[in-house]
Amino acid sequence: HEGGQDKPLLSAWPSAVVPRGGHVTLLCRSRLGFTIFSLYKEDGVPVPELYNKIFWKSILMGPVTPAHAGTYRCRGSHPRSPIEWSAPSNPLVIVVTGNSSSSSSSPTEPSSKTGIRRHLHILIGTSVAIILFIILFFFLLHCCCSNKKNAAVMDQEPAGDRTVNREDSDDQDPQEVTYAQLDHCVFTQTKITSPSQRPKTPPTDTTMYMELPNAKPRSLSPAHKHHSQALRGSSRETTALSQNRVASSHVPAAGI
């Protein structure tokens, strides 16, 4: 275990076993006073909550789906530029159980009814939006056809000039289009739940994160090659380690 005492400690609160639809807080702690962290999933499947983001202390994930299950690691750093990441933390396995969460299972989890209701709303909303889109599409198509006929008869200015040629946008860098918001740092705050919703539980913690610019990974020194595992799925900005002192050890960590 390289850099055992310097690497962060990743844990899940209240538990690494999470019911489907429930919530889990991933915490990255350290002996080196790291103030920012990057989390990634080892199987490379991107998790939206983690993708390309930097976190302050913790991140609340949920409602949890089977896609969230897997092995996670975090890296720590200090907010200097360029960001240099520590060795990866201990692996943390998140297990998603089949049943929806019940109201008593965790203070940060919604009830299963709320979860089901939310999913129904999403499903219905999406269906309605698709149907409306199809109707609108056919309506526009119809209008377009009638306009063309009218234009031919009345010799009006062609409507074609006013339509957007989709092929024109192909010249743009698709990466730039997709990640336009990442060209500058975006700070976001996400509240877990309001205190009134869950009395007699820990105070609401604010998950702070910052979206990362699409920086190319900096090359690692030969001594650190074994740490060059990219922050697959969560972050593509793998850089050199923040600790020059890297050696091997096993630090037993008591589970929570």
């Epitope: 850099g3 055992g4 005492q5 310097d6 400690l9 609160w13 209240p14 807080t25 915490l27 702690r29 350290s30 002996r31 080196l32 006073g33 790291f34 202390k57 913790s58 820990p202 105070p203 913690d205 600790q243 002192r245 890297v246 050696a247 091997s248 050890s249 096993h250 630090v251 037993p252 960590a253 008591a254 589970g255 929570i256």
Partner: antibody, heavy 117, light 107 residues
Framework: QIQLVQSGPELKKPGETVKISCKAS????????MHWVKQAPGKGLKWMGW????????TYADDFKGRFAFSLETSATTAYLQINNLKNEDTATYFC??????????WGQGTTLTVSS | DIQMTQSPASLSASVGETVTITCRTS??????LAWYQQKQGKSPQLLVY???TLVEGVPSRFSGSGSGTQFSVKINSLQPEDFGNYYC?????????FGGGTKLEIK
């Protein structure tokens, strides 16, 4: 069994230097980081910092940067705390402690340092 | 830095009584809290970690509870050997800080 045995009491004058030792036994020394904690007479516990027992890299709490130095003699499974340019306010009992998951499961018996002119 | 507020600062109780010592933190530390007992002239001894996990060998009359910012350690049926100072410490990350301590005395 696991033990952390510290050096004996010290009586020093202001401006002098002291070096306190902490000998570990009963476990693999380089598997656990070593921390130092100060306790002034009749006061509470104050974390001073820690040393990486694999690499010798020290980390100091803000109040203990400058005159304080952590070091190791890995072959002797011993950690050291050195305090330079001693002041009266350094009068305290100093503990070494082993860290597992950021809490301290084993402690040395403490070394009492008295700084007096 | 995370501030730790321990209460009461001192407590007098009789053998056989039940006492509770509390620790409040300035920010959410989830369950990362440890409790130590220190007797006069001795080093601290770990009693509880992760807020409620009792260290092997610690009598079951001790119990830890809480999460977030509010924590407590309860001692049922006090024994003569339980008297001394008690400290809480967060193990959320550096800098580690301890509570001011609670002096538990025999009434």
């Amino acid at each position: 069994q696991i033990q952390l045995v510290q050096s004996g009491p010290e009586l020093k004058k202001p401006g002098e230097t002291v070096k306190i030792s902490c000998k570990a036994s009963g476990y693999t020394f380089t598997d656990y980081s070593m921390h130092w904690v100060k306790q002034a007479p009749g006061k509470g516990l104050k974390w001073m910092g820690w040393i990486n027992t694999e690499t010798g890299g020290p980390t100091y709490a803000d109040d203990f940067k400058g005159r304080f130095a952590f070091s190791l003699e890995t072959s002797a499974t011993t950690a050291y705390l050195q305090i330079n340019n001693l002041k009266n306010e350094d009068t305290a009992t100093y503990f070494c402690s082993r860290d597992v998951d950021l809490y301290f499961d084993y402690w040395g018996q403490g070394t009492t340092l008295t700084v007096s002119s | 830095d995370i501030q730790m507020t321990q209460s009461p600062a001192s407590l007098s109780a009789s053998v056989g009584e039940t006492v509770t010592i509390t620790c409040r933190t300035s920010e959410n530390i989830y369950s990362y809290l440890a409790w130590y007992q220190q007797k006069q002239g001795k080093s601290p001894q770990l009693l509880v970690y992760n807020a409620k996990t009792l260290v092997e060998g610690v009598p079951s009359r001790f119990s830890g509870s809480g999460s977030g910012t509010q924590f407590s350690v309860k001692i049922n049926s006090l024994q003569p050997e339980d008297f001394g100072n008690y400290y809480c410490q967060h193990h959320y990350g550096i800098p580690f800080t301890f509570g001011g301590g609670t002096k538990l005395e025999i009434k």
